[in-house]
């Protein structure tokens, strides 16, 4: 039978009638209303947009559209009393100040409420001192510091370029080696790309532009005080002091004219090598310290941003399923900005709103889905995803029995070459057969389809033929729903041709600068990428939500988890010795995968027999299918970090934006011959392999045939 | 008793690629239970493992060399080779060619090794 014919609608409501109700003039205007004012997280503004979007989603056709409001911790500059950093002589003044705010955009002068560059969390301080310069503050940069430069950044303040690492990564990278402060700036040689010229002029970052930002580690805890649970009206929170994620040393953001200002004074040691200079002109010293004539000046931040716990407001809509109204697709993407939201996240949220829409026109001529679609637009993504973390937690129960697929739905944008996909493997072959539908917008592939530039754009390095899908990280709202619950995930954006920056941002990201203009003067004026992503987008909703059988296919998951078993084995495999000391083996593992590749085989075979029309069979194969993703999850965690519950992926431990496989394995095997006590460390190792081999065993058996 | 043997050139030129073969005698190479593997030991350093091969031709490699390394298995000669490409005077070192048991670093034979130098 097909969709249509499952919920007893007419052949006309198909994919086709939702994509082609989808209009690129439509998601250009509602980006432009998004983004008139500031939508920060916790403001007035955010609340009134919030109240609009539901009162148009329900105009739109929704069932129902809710507010869901929560009481969490937020972080503001102090309005009286900016941050600034300066260099202070040996009398103690200021000689240099950094500048309070970014020069607005052309137009925007007089807009109020826009709030100056700060690190969201910092705490408040005012420490003095040396400066070092510690490249992107990744965890292979302090082994350079370190171990090879043996430069010592205890008491020290270090600068540390933008880029390559989640923000927050680098602030407990510098806490970990002593630092007393840190100040993160936006280098030209990651933030400005060659032969474009800067804001209002092209989409390069001006010299006075600055990437806002919070740096907590929370780990997926959601609301730093109210972790594993929701905060609501009745929630006990714990006291600052044991609060999940704050950093312990100021941090502040600058641009790179005030980031030149300090480096060019810069001594001590020069740089290690040429991957640690970036483009300005400016030796790139490490330090510590000014050199010769300045040797005596010193670095003071000047921090006030206070903690508070403020009201949030997510906005939840939902379209009711015909046939399986308890299982649960949920398109969400977030609605505060930092400033303006031009790309982050309005380009999203005007992608919903298009989507929204669509499905709204659809059911008004009668159709429903066959499940229920719920849709959301998340607040305080920027503070920690905790919007939708909240809500997560609070409706957890319902989710992990219900809940099929989450699809988010960030910036739609962050450059306009081809398509970029992260997503679960069951969902490959659902983008793959979608892809192939759809028309690419890509200059130079009129009449092709989309899966044909981005296979060409953006291929495979492991299957030709193929595109590129990366696997899922964090950094954005799909956290708690991947990584703590289980529930199948994806995101889909057009990017850059840029891979070497994957995780740097494009250059005006959580600046002032990033306006409607940006989007509809440089990035996309025909808006028709933003189409693209929302066909994109919305194609895997529709199917998720109306396909007979659910469009996962579990053979992939097979073939990723054997990748992912080589290339860890690899790595346990360059300490040979000490694999053989502690008769270490990955036996169990590999054992592991062969049997979930034999059971996924099987599993796939009944899949393509089994009578469709027999509800209960049908629902019971589906089910097998939906809580696959979820039989991969370990209700303990992962070590030190409970909310990351995923056995096969979790953000990096070194980087929150980029995912990692086998985790646990991983961050066991990192640095392992450094470690005091060798015989514990590889325990830890034989342990995770344990685990990760039972895990991949426990989920085949829930693809075998139930009795 | 099963024997392996390493057998290439002692001198490579930089930038050029380094091949070695290892012929297995004693025993067939066509088992699922053993992997056959390089590793190598630079002067004055510890071991280093390169890399291995199933029978069917199946690979692992060092993460640190997978660009540079190509390992590949001939079971009707019952030998497995190495290539290692764009080499420095850093690939210097004694190259040996073990079995060992699959999943596992359990290297319970190997050849008596050979000195390749990397020079000019």
């Known amino acids: 039978k097909s969709s249509n014919e499952a919920t007893n609608i007419t052949p006309k409501h198909n994919m086709k009638a939702f994509l082609d109700e989808l209009k690129a003039e439509n998601i250009k205007k509602f980006l432009y209303n998004f983004t008139q004012i500031p939508h920060l997280a916790g403001t007035e503004q955010n609340f009134q947009l919030a109240k609009q979007i539901q009162s148009q989603w329900k105009e739109f056709g929704l069932d129902s559209v809710e507010l869901a409001h929560y009481d969490v911790l937020l972080s503001y500059p102090n309005k009286t009393h900016p941050n600034y950093i300066s260099i202070i002589n040996e009398d103690g003044n200021e000689i240099f100040n950094t500048s309070l705010f970014e020069p607005p955009p052309p137009g925007y002068e007089n807009v109020s409420d826009i709030v100056p560059p700060f690190s969201a969390f910092s705490p408040q301080g005012m420490p003095e001192g040396d400066l070092v310069y510690v490249n992107y503050a990744r965890t292979e940069d302090f082994f350079k510091l370190e171990r090879d430069m043996k430069i010592n950044c205890s008491g020290k303040i270090v600068i540390a370029r933008y880029g390559k690492v989640f923000r927050g990564n680098k602030v407990k990278n510098a806490q970990l080696a002593g630092a007393k402060g840190v100040i993160l700036y936006s280098d030209p040689a990651d933030y400005f790309a060659p032969g474009v010229k800067s804001y209002p002029d092209g989409w390069n970052l001006p010299g006075g532009g600055v990437q806002r930002g919070n740096i907590l580690n929370l780990n997926g805890a959601g609301d730093p005080l109210t972790p594993g649970y929701p905060a609501n009206e009745y929630a006990y929170r714990r006291g600052i002091a044991e609060a999940v994620g704050l950093p312990s040393i100021p941090v502040h953001p600058i641009g790179y004219y005030d980031a030149q200002k300090l480096l060019e004074k810069m001594g001590g040691s020069a740089p290690p090598d040429s991957s640690w200079r970036g483009s300005l002109k400016v030796p790139y010293n490490v330090g510590p310290g000014f050199t010769g004539n300045f040797s005596t000046q010193k670095v003071k931040m000047h921090i006030h941003s206070t903690n508070e716990v403020t009201r949030i407001y997510n906005v939840i809509g939902t379209l009711r399923g015909a046939v399986e109204p308890d299982r649960y697709v949920i398109l969400g993407g977030h609605r505060d900005s930092w400033v303006f939201g031009g790309i982050d996240p309005q380009s999203g949220a005007a992608v919903v709103h298009e989507i929204v829409r669509s499905f709204g026109t659809l059911k008004k001529e009668g159709w429903r889905p066959r499940r229920t679609i719920l849709f959301a637009s998340w607040d305080a993504e920027e503070f920690g995803l905790l919007g939708s973390t909240e809500w997560a937690e609070e409706n957890s129960r319902l989710l992990q029995e219900r809940g099929v697929a989450y699809i988010n739905a960030d910036s739609s944008i962050e450059g306009n070459y081809t398509l970029r996909v992260d997503c679960t493997p069951l969902m490959y072959s659902l983008v793959h057969n979608l892809t192939k539908e759809l028309k690419s917008p890509d200059e130079g592939f009129e009449g092709k389809s989309l899966y044909e530039s981005w296979t060409k754009k953006s291929p495979s390095p492991e299957f030709s033929g193929m595109p590129r899908i990366s696997k899922l990280g964090s950094g954005n709202d799909f956290e708690v729903f991947f990584q703590r619950l289980g529930i199948a995930s994806g995101r889909a954006r057009y990017t850059k041709n840029w891979e070497t920056n994957k995780f740097s941002g494009y250059p005006l990201y959580h600046s002032v600068y990033e306006t409607y203009e940006l989007v509809e003067k440089f990035y996309d004026p025909m808006f028709k990428y933003h189409l693209t992503v929302a066909q994109v987008r919305g194609g895997m909703v529709f199917e998720l939500a109306n396909s007979i059988v659910l469009p996962f296919d579990c053979r992939d998951y097979a073939v990723v988890l054997r990748k992912y078993a080589d290339k860890i084995y690899s790595i346990s495999m360059k300490h040979p010795q000490e694999m053989k000391t502690y008769s270490v083996s990955f036996d169990s593992l590999f054992s592991a995968v062969k049997n979930f590749t034999e059971i996924a085989s099987k599993f796939s075979e009944r899949l393509q027999d089994f009578d469709k029309s027999n509800p209960i069979v049908l629902r019971m194969m589906n089910d097998q299918l939906m809580f696959l993703e979820r039989a991969f999850i370990d209700p303990l965690g992962l070590p030190d970090r409970p909310f990351y519950r995923h056995v096969i992926y979790a953000p990096s431990s070194h980087n929150k934006y980029a995912g990692e496989s086998f985790p646990g394995i991983y961050d066991a095997l990192f640095d392992i011959e450094s470690k005091v006590d060798p015989s514990k460390a590889w325990g830890e190792v034989k342990r995770q392999i344990y685990v990760a081999a039972f895990t991949v065993q426990a989920a085949a058996e829930t693809l075998s045939e139930v009795a | 008793q099963l024997q392996l043997q390493e057998s290439g050139p002692g001198l490579v030129k930089p930038s050029e690629t380094l091949s070695l073969t290892c012929t297995v005698s004693g025993g067939s190479i066509s088992s699922s239970s053993y992997y056959w593997g390089w590793i190598r030991q630079p002067p004055g350093k510890g071991l280093e493992w390169i890399?291995?091969?199933?029978?069917?031709?199946?690979?692992y490699y060092n993460p640190s060399l997978q660009s540079r390394v190509t390992i590949s298995v001939d079971t009707s000669k019952n030998q497995f080779s190495l290539k290692l490409s764009s080499v420095t005077a850093a690939d210097t070192a004694v190259y040996n060619c073990?079995?060992?048991?699959?999943?596992?670093?359990?290297?319970?034979?190997r050849g008596q090794g050979t000195l390749v130098t990397v020079s000019s």
């Open positions: 073990a079995r060992h048991k699959a999943a596992t670093a359990d290297f319970d034979y």
């Open positions: 890399g291995s091969v199933d029978y069917s031709g199946y690979t």
